[in-house]
Amino acid sequence: MGKSLSHLPLHSSKEDAYDGVTSENMRNGLVNSEVHNEDGRNGDVSQFPYVEFTGRDSVTCPTCQGTGRIPRGQENQLVALIPYSDQRLRPRRTKLYVMASVFVCLLLSGLAVFFLFPRSIDVKYIGVKSAYVSYDVQKRTIYLNITNTLNITNNNYYSVEVENITAQVQFSKTVIGKARLNNITIIGPLDMKQIDYTVPTVIAEEMSYMYDFCTLISIKVHNIVLMMQVTVTTTYFGHSEQISQERYQYVDCGRNTTYQLGQSEYLNVLQPQQ
């Protein structure tokens, strides 16, 4: 209560004592809560705007002789009595302000949730882009460098980082090649990027019979079925997410081939022209 004095238009005189001015103080809305003034410094006062509110009009408060000053020592000793009907106790826009604040908070929260809510990152394996083949005649080994294409779509309203891509190629349930790409790219909000990655593969040893097939040049197309596996790791807000895809693809092991995107998926295995 004492703190609110500094915001109230009341005055008191530094020489007012409790017993001498009680009725006047009470009438004017000031009560001395102490018997005497503990602060004896005369010049140490605080300046406040002053109005005495009687209910009808404003008059000079005799408690402080109209000086508009309350001695500093009495700041915490005087209590203001204000009529309940004082409009200043009831600001007209409080509800409006509260409602507006709540609405703004809800709006901001909703927008934050809408824009920051994690959405899916779509990974679409498009297919084999090219396959470059070489042979080791001595070892009866086939080396295939297979370049694949991925489409990665970011459905979020913020950028995501494609941290790494790990890929492996299987032939006849045997892993013949692996690759890993790190720190690849950053995909912007609602953006899509096409990423090419190459997997070096080796067909050898117990699969050396494939060498006979792939180097049999009386066949025009030496299609072999490979299983492409790819795992894309993306990060956003420190959160890591992995998306995997598997696809069977035809690859020509008999010659260097560049494919139209998606073409290698639908090729039929052609028969030799003998």
Epitope: V133, V137, Y209, D212, F213, C214, I217, S218, G254
Partner: antibody, heavy 119, light 112 residues
Framework: QVTLKESGPGIVQPSQTLSLTCSFS??????????VGWIRQPSGKGLEWLAK???????FYYPALKSRLTISKDTSKNQIFLKIANVDTADSATYYC???????????WGQGTTLTVSS | DIVMTQAAFSNPVTLGTSASISCRSS???????????LYWYLQKPGQSPQLLIS???SLASGVPDRFSSGGSGTDFTLRISRVEAEDVGVFYC?????????FGGGTKLELK
């Protein structure tokens, strides 16, 4: 271990149809890039391709003899058959069957069967 | 057809010395895939032919490394570094590049 063995009548009369059989073991003719071929060698002369059959049942015949040759296979029995129609004395030779492959050529050969065309 | 040409006889060689056998093709046997489709076979007296070398330079399994092969697209040489008595026979070159596959006439290795 890959083995091939040819069998035939030994002697046939001119204008008859000759049937030869190649029985093999140690490999499968269902494997990609594998096949079996027939080669013949007249006495004291060089080698001549006759026909070949591949894992996918595709067949090839030496162009000059194509009209007289028929090659077939029974994969379940691991056997290859060659028929030569309308034989004459020029067909007298040792007939070999060999396992063939695109990369390695005729890597394994049978011991051969000698055919004599005689009236 | 691709014609494979060989001399009927080699120069007589002494056991333990090296020997060379030549073969020529009527067309380059080097394919666009980098492989040369030339093969060497040895037929020992009274036996079936056996594969020595496939695709110009690859030694067949079980063949001693005394044998080696080289050449360009059309001219090829089979080398035997130390000739042994068991090497005697007829050496055939062959091509698998085009249909029909064809053999050379064969070169007989003769000893001095």
């Amino acid at each position: 271990q890959v083995t091939l063995k040819e069998s035939g009548p030994g002697i046939v009369q001119p204008s008859q149809t000759l049937s030869l059989t190649c029985s093999f073991s140690g490999f499968s003719l269902n494997t990609l890039g594998r096949g079996v071929g027939w080669i013949r060698q007249p006495s004291g002369k060089g080698l001549e391709w006759l026909a070949k059959i591949w894992w996918n049942d595709d067949k090839f015949y030496y162009p000059a003899l194509k009209s007289r040759l028929t090659i077939s296979k029974d994969t379940s029995k691991n056997q290859i058959f060659l028929k030569i129609a309308n034989v004459d004395t020029a067909d007298s030779a040792t007939y070999y069957c060999a396992r063939i492959a695109g990369g390695t050529g005729a890597a394994y050969w049978g011991q051969g069967t000698t055919l004599t065309v005689s009236s | 057809d691709i014609v494979m040409t060989q001399a009927a006889f080699s120069n007589p060689v002494t056991l333990g010395t090296s020997a060379s056998i030549s073969c020529r093709s009527s067309k380059s046997l080097l394919h666009s895939n980098g492989i040369t489709y030339l093969y060497w076979y040895l037929q020992k007296p009274g036996q079936s032919p056996q594969l020595l070398i496939s695709q110009m330079s690859s030694l067949a399994s079980g063949v001693p490394d005394r044998f080696s092969s080289g050449g360009s697209g059309t001219d090829f040489t089979l080398r035997i570094s130390r000739v042994e008595a068991e090497d005697v026979g007829v050496f055939y070159c062959a091509q698998n590049l085009e249909l029909p596959w064809t053999f050379g006439g064969g070169t007989k290795l003769e000893l001095k």
